[in-house]
Each structure stands twice: as structure tokens, then as C-alpha cells.
């Protein structure tokens, strides 16, 4: 069963989110389940490291963008949120928390600031930001 859920604080328009765990999940209570991923948008502003710790404490990680098709709800996300993308100064690469290197196919990086962390914005954009700047954040948990 699908329900058109309008989450005004999170998304720019109506987003289809499944409500039954038989189609998606299981996810932690009150998290959004979408195409075999669990997401939670946290309103409190934390720096990147605190955001990462918060996600880890809930057995999750910061958002990883791995597929536009599977994560098409991210196209509509409002505002800017920490995701799990960091610059590794030792090798110069931009990597996800799991060590995989960001593919330019998945995110267009916009270099507004100097920094080693990145904020997710709508339409698969990533904005470079200083890791110590407080921002809201998105946690993600894979269900499969």
C-alpha cells in the first residue's frame, strides 16, 4: 500500500512513501522507508563529526548517495544537510564513510567554501563546507 505523504518540512513537493514494512524495511521507529533504505532527517544542527556519531549511535551512517533511481526521493529534499562524504587529505580524494570514492555521475559537487565535508542539497547536488559548521543531517540505514 502506498500513501502520498506530504512532509512539508523535508521535501519540496509530494513524495510517495510506502507505509507497510512488507514492502520496505524494517526501519527504526519513525524513520522513512523508501526503496529498501531507511532515512531520518534530524533537525538539530551539529558539526559533521557529531552528526556522524549521532547516526552511528543509531546503527546507521550519514547519507550515502549510490543510485539516483533508488534514491529518487532525495531529488526533492529541502535545504542543506550533512551527508557521509568527506575529503581525505592524505590521498586527496572525496570518499564516502565506507571508503568508496564519489562518482561524478551521482553528485554534482559545488565548491562554495573551503572544507573537507559536504552538504547534500536537492537535485543531487553536494556543497563543500567546513566540517565544524553546524548543520542538520540525514542518517541512512540499508535494509538489504
Amino acid at each position: 500500500i502506498w500513501s502520498a505523504v506530504f512532509l512539508n518540512s523535508l521535501f519540496n513537493q509530494e513524495v510517495q512513501i510506502p507505509l507497510t514494512e512488507s514492502y520496505c524495511g524494517p526501519c527504526p521507529k519513525n524513520w522513512i522507508c523508501y526503496k529498501n533504505n531507511c532515512y531520518q532527517f534530524f533537525d538539530e544542527s551539529k558539526n559533521w563529526y557529531e552528526s556522524q556519531a549521532s547516526c552511528m549511535s543509531q546503527n546507521a551512517s550519514l547519507l550515502k548517495v549510490y543510485s539516483k533511481e533508488d534514491q529518487d526521493l532525495l531529488k526533492l529534499v529541502k535545504s542543506y544537510h550533512w551527508m557521509g562524504l568527506v575529503h581525505i587529505p592524505t590521498n586527496g580524494s572525496w570518499q564516502w564513510e565506507d571508503g568508496s570514492i564519489l562518482s561524478p555521475n551521482l553528485l554534482t559537487i559545488i565548491e562554495m567554501q573551503k572544507g573537507d565535508c559536504a552538504l547534500y542539497a536537492s537535485s543531487f547536488k553536494g556543497y563543500i563546507e567546513n566540517c565544524s559548521t553546524p548543520n542538520t543531517y540525514i542518517c541512512m540505514q540499508r535494509t538489504v
Partner: antibody
Amino acid sequence: QVQLVQSGAEVKKPGASVKVSCKASGYTFTSYWMNWVRQAPGQGLEWMGRIDPYDSETHYNQKFQGRVTMTVDKSTSTAYMELSSLRSEDTAVYYCAKMGDYSFDYWGQGTLVTVSS
Amino acid sequence: DIQLTQSPSSLSASVGDRVTITCRASGNIHNYLAWYQQKPGKSPKVLVYNAKTLADGVPSRFSGSGSGTDYTLTISSLQPEDFATYYCQHFWSTTWTFGGGTKVEIK
């Protein structure tokens, strides 16, 4: 196997427009940016721009801004590049190129566009 | 927009020589650099991506290195089939560009 098949050679008059097509097969068309690159006779490669077939987002080389339009037809997995207000300096081979994870991993065979009065 | 300056624009070398081509970016491109080989009348072919990873099927005599703004393609022992033009290209941010190319000719 991945294939990018481009339309045939074109001869155009100065001031006219040209539209080159690139039919993709062998991969999920909407998952990878499609790029257009040109090469004038005896010259180097010049990136013209790219389009995301997923949502038709485009980024163009500033040099071509206002003259180039990139589009896709998802139903036929075909990308198009239209260049307007042609001049003799636009005589070149035009390539489409699929963005792999970290490089242009597949290229079309090229389309020669000749601009001559 | 980040520009790439490739050098030299051409070089003459003999079979067995070690050849080095450099590519300098006008800003940090964070290893988002690929190297291509192009032969006359043919489409380019990727050799190296992420600055140092060899593409599938590319002989091990090719190698890439560098970080930040300075990158290098090295051919450890030039073979007859390596005489071609080589291009670097970056994928950082929204606008992607090629270097001017390096033509490797037979001495």
C-alpha cells in the same frame, strides 16, 4: 555490450543549425551522464557539455552557452546535441561519450559536421 | 572554471624510452583526472582514471600519478603501438575540460 551509435555526416551552411544524435544501448541509459566532445581538424578534444538522462539537467561549456542545446529521449535511449548559428570554425568531428564511474568509458564513432558556404 | 595545461605539446621518442607527460590544473581537482589515448581517425580510449587507476585491459607500462593540481602519465617503455596523442581531462565540479594534448611521435 555498450554501444553509442551516432548519426551520419552533415554539411551545413553558415548560420544554420545541426542536430546530431547518439543512440545508446547495452547499459541503463538514465544512470550515466552523456557528454558531447568535439575535435576540429588537426586540433585537440574540446568538451562541449553534458546532460543527465535521469532528469535532463545540463551543464555547458561557457564557450557554447546560448548556441548549444542537449536533449535526451529516454524512450529510445537517444541523446541529441543541437548547435545553432554555425560558422566555419564549427567544422569538426562531434563525439558523444558516456560518463562511466570516473571517466568517459565509451565513445560514439564520431559525426563529421562540415560548415561551408 | 578549472583549466588544464598539458606539457609538452609534442615529443619525439624511440621504442623502449620512458615517456612522461604532465597535466597541471588551475585549481585542486581532487584526483578526478583521466588520461586518454587517441589514434588518428579513431575515438579516444581511456587509459587511467582517478589519477592513478589503470583502466581494464590497459598494459601495465602505463601509469598515472599526482594529486591536487599536478598529475603525470608515464609510459615506462614506449612500444610501437603507443605512438598517438594523449589527453588529460578533469571531472571536478560542474564544468569538465580537456588538456591541450601531447602528440608522441617516433624519433
